[in-house]
Interface confidence: medium
Amino acid sequence: CTCVPPHPQTAFCNSDLVIRAKFVGTPEVNQTTLYQRYEIKMTKMYKGFQALGDAADIRFVYTPAMESVCGYFHRSHNRSEEFLIAGKLQDGLLHITTCSFVAPWNSLSLAQRRGFTKTYTVGCEECTVFPCLSIPCKLQSGTHCLWTDQLLQGSEKGFQSRHLACLPREPGLCTWQSLRSQIA
């Protein structure tokens, strides 16, 4: 299973649930479904209050038990390390794959943290991060922001990923804006 890591804003906007959590338990494989589940301890929720309703405590995250079908395998053994997890809700359960945005909270730039905490949501309604995978590429719409990080370096490590968000400038127009300049 291969996929290009998304811009964190795309991950935020396309996910049902975005949380901060620790992986605390030993993973278990369900012998019937061949899904494995990781026990987590949620410390913050950034998106998903409405989707979850009253069941606002997520205790497990589910993923296929094989990487060949995009199963996520958690490598860290540090149970106190916090991770940003952006996933989908299926039947009230949080599901992730290799293609989901899952990253140590400490590895995120301050700008990205600010994005997940409050800013990315502003761009979800109107704006689209549009990946530019090969030159030439052009904007399809005024509401698109061209994402060129992959042309230069790893998509997660690029300047646009780590420091910028695609936000409305005026109706029908979105531009890259610095997350540093946003109110903390």
Epitope: P27, T32, T33, E67, F73
Partner: antibody
């Protein structure tokens, strides 16, 4: 007591087809993922395919993808492996095994020989 | 693709001796997805250890598993005559159900 009994093996020509069956008893069949594992004469074990309890998810080794199809009939407690476009290198004892990711019960195997 | 390499290929020991079998993965394997099997001639394999260190039902306590990451070990503390067989390690997940090539434990 868990029992798995394979059948359907035999001699087949290259390019031919064969359908293996595995009759299961002694456990709740529909709640267990099942797998096929094979062993060529004098060689080691090679996983072939797996299927979830409901039959909704199937998995294959690259060596058989597109040629073999795993299925199950939970009403008959039976696992199947349909093998098409058979090659000489498919010659092996085929075992059905209960569960995954580890295989806690195995059948005694059925020999498939692909030869002209 | 992940590869599991078992060593040694053959282990020649006497009953009562300690056997140490190694399984090395080409990349990190999830501990809960690693298992060991025993196979005797003409028989189906039998699950010995799952989750790298948990003994399967009915397996004597002379069998133990350990390890994490890329290095795993099966230890038989005192070999009994019925322990002479081929042993396979197996992982699930990175590439489905990959087996090692096996270690034969034979009577010296």
């Amino acid at each position: 007591e868990v029992q798995l009994l394979e059948s359907g093996g035999g001699l087949v020509q290259p390019g031919g087809s064969l359908r293996l069956s595995c009759a299961a008893s002694g456990f709740t069949f529909s709640s267990a993922a099942m797998s096929w594992v094979r062993q060529a004469p004098g060689k080691g074990l090679e996983w072939v395919s797996a299927i979830s309890g409901s039959g909704g998810s199937t998995y294959y080794a690259d060596s058989v993808k597109g040629r073999f199809t795993i299925s199950r009939d939970n009403s008959k407690n039976t696992l199947y492996l349909q093998m098409n476009s058979l090659r000489a290198e498919d010659t092996a004892v085929y075992y059905c095994a209960k569960s995954a990711p580890m295989f806690d019960y195995w059948g005694q195997g059925t020999l498939v020989t692909v030869s002209s | 693709e992940i590869v599991l390499t078992q060593s040694p290929g053959t282990l020649s020991l006497s009953p009562g001796e300690r056997a140490t079998l190694s399984c090395r993965a080409s990349q990190s394997v999830s501990t809960h997805l690693l298992a060991w099997y025993q196979q005797k001639p003409g028989q189906a394999p039998r699950l010995l250890i799952y989750g790298a260190s948990s003994r399967a039902t009915g397996i004597p306590d002379r069998f133990s598993g350990s390890g994490s990451g890329t290095d795993f070990t099966l230890t038989i503390s005192r070999l009994e005559p019925e322990d002479f067989a081929v042993y396979y390690c197996q992982q699930w997940g990175l590439t489905p159900a990959m087996f090692g090539q096996g270690t034969k434990v034979e009577i010296k």
